[in-house]
């Protein structure tokens, strides 16, 4: 099942970095080639093309976004998951987080909410009416929060759930990691990096490295020759 | 420090229940998912079961689907395996296990026995 | 499903260098480039020791790295030591749904 939704990737830098985060020095260059993601949001897309962005929680997704199964009815079947475009005005839902903000989930259609000026956090949080759910969790879904409200009081350490890298202590940048978005540790020197070169060949990201560290560029392995090209073994390197 | 104590496990006959716990402290426990990892005795390591941050997301290994539940309580810093309809084949050491980078903090593991 | 293969046994002498290997299918080791090593003493808890292929988490003796080719991950363990004869485990995962797979396991005795 893994073939067609893994592939490996850098996360790549805020562009620009955020200050006080993992993501290098303010204002130092960044190279980006055509197609290679960037982090826009809280979601990864191609500068010239949106790639569905993988999820596990409806928090992970943006605030106009909501986390299920690409396919309908494919969901609680171990479908990959991703973030899709909330519900507009009197679309069908089976949950608030479906619905756009200044809405929430009445009797399965997206009614206007009286409280559209509170965060969407805080109107969930205050209406409890469970109309199923259509993750693969099976449980009733819990009103959806911000994480930064909730988490991101301090730094993230390595393995902490995050949003972008400024949520990471110093080091860490903010990349997919199978079940979420963590904080990782920025690439030293020797360690293996991905290097993206054919434009969509990103798929769904469900494991990213993050970038190499200052001074350093992810290049191929000097003595790592093998036979087929995609398989050459990228490092970080001295510039 | 990062620690992770186990209890709830002991001797159940099958077809029983048992309640795990595992108490979490040294570190910001509602920032990780986390999971269940059982070895039976002299068996090697099985992945039992994994829970996101905010306990809404949750999967489990073919063999415990419908009979165990796993969930946490983030304000008592605690996670939770519910195991309903034990089976000899279920006697194992239980760990919990903290999913940061991998697999990458666990408990000292719990005994559960089922036999008649 | 996807499998990990561990050999069930290997051994050296202290000094000497060892390597387990861990074969998998295309879609788990090979496929995505991702695995992980847990050293586990007997009668205590696993330790991660490797992830990523071959990233040391702070606090783990250089002496251990690992590395991949093909469908093959390989943990070696260099300047062999007594407190190094243990279990290890190679791990990867499956994303859907989400699942730990580990490899059978792997004796490492220090001989003499």
């Known amino acids: 099942t893994l073939n067609s939704v893994l592939i490996n990737s850098n996360a790549i830098k805020n562009l620009p970095p955020p200050l006080g985060g993992a993501g290098g020095q303010p204002g130092s260059a960044v190279s980006v080639a055509p197609g290679v993601l960037y982090e826009g949001g809280n979601k990864y897309q191609t500068l010239d093309n949106y790639q569905p962005y993988p999820c596990a929680e409806d928090e992970e997704c943006g605030t106009d976004e909501y986390c299920s199964s690409p396919s309908r009815g494919a969901a609680g079947v171990g479908g990959v998951q991703i973030c899709l475009a909330c519900r507009k005005r009197r679309k069908r839902c089976m949950r608030h987080a479906m619905c756009c903000p200044g809405n929430y989930c009445k009797n399965g259609i997206c009614m206007p909410s009286d409280h559209s000026h509170l965060p969407r956090g805080e109107i969930e949080e205050g209406i409890i009416e469970n109309l199923g759910n259509d993750h693969g969790a099976g449980d009733g879904y819990p009103r959806r929060t911000t994480l930064t409200s909730k988490i991101y009081h301090t730094k993230g350490q390595e393995g902490s759930v995050c949003l972008r890298s400024s949520d990471c202590a110093t080091g860490l940048c903010c990349a997919r990691h199978f079940w979420s978005k963590i904080c990782k540790p920025v690439l030293k020197e020797g360690q293996v990096c991905t290097k993206h070169r054919r434009k969509g060949s990103h798929g769904l990201e469900i494991f990213q490295r993050c970038y190499c560290g200052e001074g350093l560029a992810c290049r191929i392995q000097k003595d790592h020759h093998q036979t087929s090209n995609s398989s050459r073994l990228h490092t970080c390197q001295r510039h | 420090q990062v620690q992770l104590v186990e209890s709830g496990g002991g001797l159940v006959q099958p077809g029983g229940s048992l309640r795990l716990s595992c108490a979490a402290s040294g570190f910001t426990f509602s920032s990780y998912w986390m999971s269940w990892v059982r070895q039976a005795p002299g068996k090697g390591l099985e992945w039992v079961s994994g829970i996101s941050y905010s306990g809404s997301n949750t999967h489990y290994a073919d063999s415990v689907k419908g009979r165990f539940t796993i969930s946490r309580d983030n304000s008592k810093n605690t996670l939770y395996l519910q195991m309903n309809s034990l089976r000899a084949e279920d006697t194992a050491v239980y760990y919990c296990a903290r999913m940061g980078i991998d697999l990458d903090y666990w408990g000292q593991g719990t005994l559960v026995t089922v036999s008649s | 499903d996807i499998a990990l293969t561990q050999p069930a046994s290997v051994s050296g002498s202290p000094g000497q260098s060892i390597t387990i290997s861990c074969t998998g299918t295309?879609?788990?080791?090979?496929?995505?480039?991702?695995v992980s090593w847990y050293q586990q003493h007997p009668g205590k808890a696993p330790k991660l020791m490797i992830h990523d292929g071959s990233n040391r988490p702070s606090g783990v003796s250089n002496r251990f790295s690992g590395s991949k080719s093909g469908n093959t991950a390989s943990l070696t363990i260099s300047g062999l030591q007594a407190e190094d004869e243990a279990d290890y485990y190679c791990?990867?995962?499956?994303?859907?749904?989400?699942?730990?797979?580990f490899g059978g396991g792997t004796k490492l005795t220090v001989l003499g």
């Open positions: 295309s879609s788990d080791v090979g496929g995505f480039n991702y």
């Open positions: 791990q990867s995962w499956d994303v859907s749904p989400i699942t730990a797979v």
